[in-house]
């Protein structure tokens, strides 16, 4: 903390301007009025204060606003935002998307910091749900944002917001997250025609159930292998060879290269070898001819 000393004669700041970069920390503390700083925060970002000098300016604002900064100040924090702790940010009430954008801009190009995560959390909680404009903004700055949320948090995403999601935003999502997002996407895109629908829903299919995959297989969608490999194993297993062939279209040949990997490996084990042979791909490991397959799960359900 900077020692309190009297401001030297003639150095009292009348406005926040470039001359202040020549002040030592103790001079900033002594010569810059906190209320002046608060009203001219929009100038701070344009002035190349060192990080040490920014510490002093933050200290002045902390003293002026012990209960947390008003949004008029927060919106213009600029580089000073990098000096805030999650504890500082928890005191804020950020309601404007413009404020959120301004602060995310400062952190642009860096990993999501604890400060940014706290800011987003405060903002989303204040709004009550992750609306489309917010999601648009967050995924523009952090493509992996959606996949950083828990399934519980994702449940507050309204289907209308799904339109803002790009395929790369889902790259790091796990099946539990896609299980939540897929029904929302299905609802959001329900009025689109076949091929357009498939283009939009494709990234979300890691959460699709068997019946939806069966339905897609009737629509000549030509799913690529990368998408197929991300499908839920339990959703793929009940598909017949004919259904998988229709689902993949010309991409069916790619199954050979993936025959040792899930879900292809597990699916092969469930198919009759005769049926697999009809694909002409040399897939091995199916149920030999003449064997009877008992589905014990069905038997248990009936008893």
């Amino acid at each position: 903390e900077v020692e309190k000393t009297a401001c030297p004669s003639g150095k009292k700041a009348r406005e926040i301007d470039e001359s202040l970069i020549f002040y030592k920390k103790w001079e900033l503390e002594a010569c810059v009025d906190a209320a002046l700083l608060a009203t001219q925060m929009d100038r701070v970002n344009a002035i190349p204060f060192t990080y040490e000098q920014l510490d002093v300016l933050k200290h002045k604002l902390d003293e002026l606003y012990p209960q947390g900064y008003p949004e008029s100040v927060i919106q213009h924090l600029g580089y000073l935002f990098l000096k805030m702790s999650p504890e500082d940010i928890r005191k804020w009430n950020v309601t404007s998307l413009e404020t959120l954008k301004a602060l995310l801009e400062v952190n642009k190009g860096h990993e999501m910091s604890p400060q940014v995560a706290t800011l987003i959390d405060r903002f989303v909680k204040g709004r009550g749900q992750l609306d489309k404009d917010t999601l648009d903004t967050l995924t523009a700055f952090y493509p992996g944002y959606l996949c950083s949320l828990s399934p519980e948090e994702l449940s507050s995403v309204p289907p209308s917001s799904i339109w803002a999601v790009r395929p790369q935003d889902l790259d790091t999502c796990d099946p539990r997250q896609l299980d939540v997002l897929y029904p929302k996407a299905r609802l959001a895109f329900q009025n689109m025609n076949g091929s357009e629908y498939f283009v939009k829903i494709q990234s979300f299919l890691g959460g699709a159930p068997t019946e939806d995959l069966k339905a897609l297989s009737q629509q000549n969608v030509s799913m690529d292998l990368a998408t197929f490999m991300k499908l839920r194993t339990d959703a793929v297993l009940p598909l017949t060879v004919a259904e998988v062939q229709k689902l993949l279209g010309p991409h069916v040949e790619g199954l050979k290269a993936e025959e040792r990997h899930r879900p292809v490996r597990d699916w092969i084990l469930r198919q009759r070898q005769d049926d697999l042979d009809t694909l002409g791909l040399g897939l091995q490991g199916g149920i030999p001819n003449g064997y009877l397959v008992l589905d014990l799960s069905m038997q248990e359900a009936l008893s």
């Epitope: 970069i21 190349p48 204060f49 060192t50 990080y51 040490e52 000098q53 920014l54 580089y79």
Partner: nanobody
């Protein structure tokens, strides 16, 4: 990667002259505002002088009229000409891009002025 190589420090008598040089690489030099910072033993970091991309210069009150900052864009080099040196100018001098905001942190050049 931004690199700044400083030279020209040393020991002089009060009233003498010294010129510091700083050669930059890894960024667009002629678009950048540059500055010289200094830190005396046991004192705070202080900005001594700045030169903006358009060539305009500014100085701390303590060095006005004695120090001159200049740059040679062809050589990617910024200079600090220090005349009428005083013992209180003794410090480690560092050249920085103003956008880096790091002030005196890191390496620098020792200038010692004895009376």
């Amino acid at each position: 990667e931004v690199q700044l190589v400083e030279s020209g420090g040393g020991s002089v008598q009060a009233g003498e002259t010294l010129r510091l040089s700083c050669t930059a690489s890894g960024f667009t030099f002629d678009d950048s505002d540059m500055g010289w910072y200094r830190q005396a033993p046991g004192d705070e970091c202080e900005l001594v002088s700045t030169i903006s991309s358009d060539g305009s210069t500014n100085y701390a009150d303590s060095v006005k009229g004695r120090f001159t900052i200049s740059q040679d864009n062809a050589k990617n080099t910024v200079y600090l000409q220090m005349t009428s040196l005083k013992p209180e100018d003794t410090a480690i001098y560092s050249c920085r891009t103003m956008a880096s905001r790091i002030g005196c942190w890191g390496q620098g050049n020792l200038v010692t002025v004895s009376s």
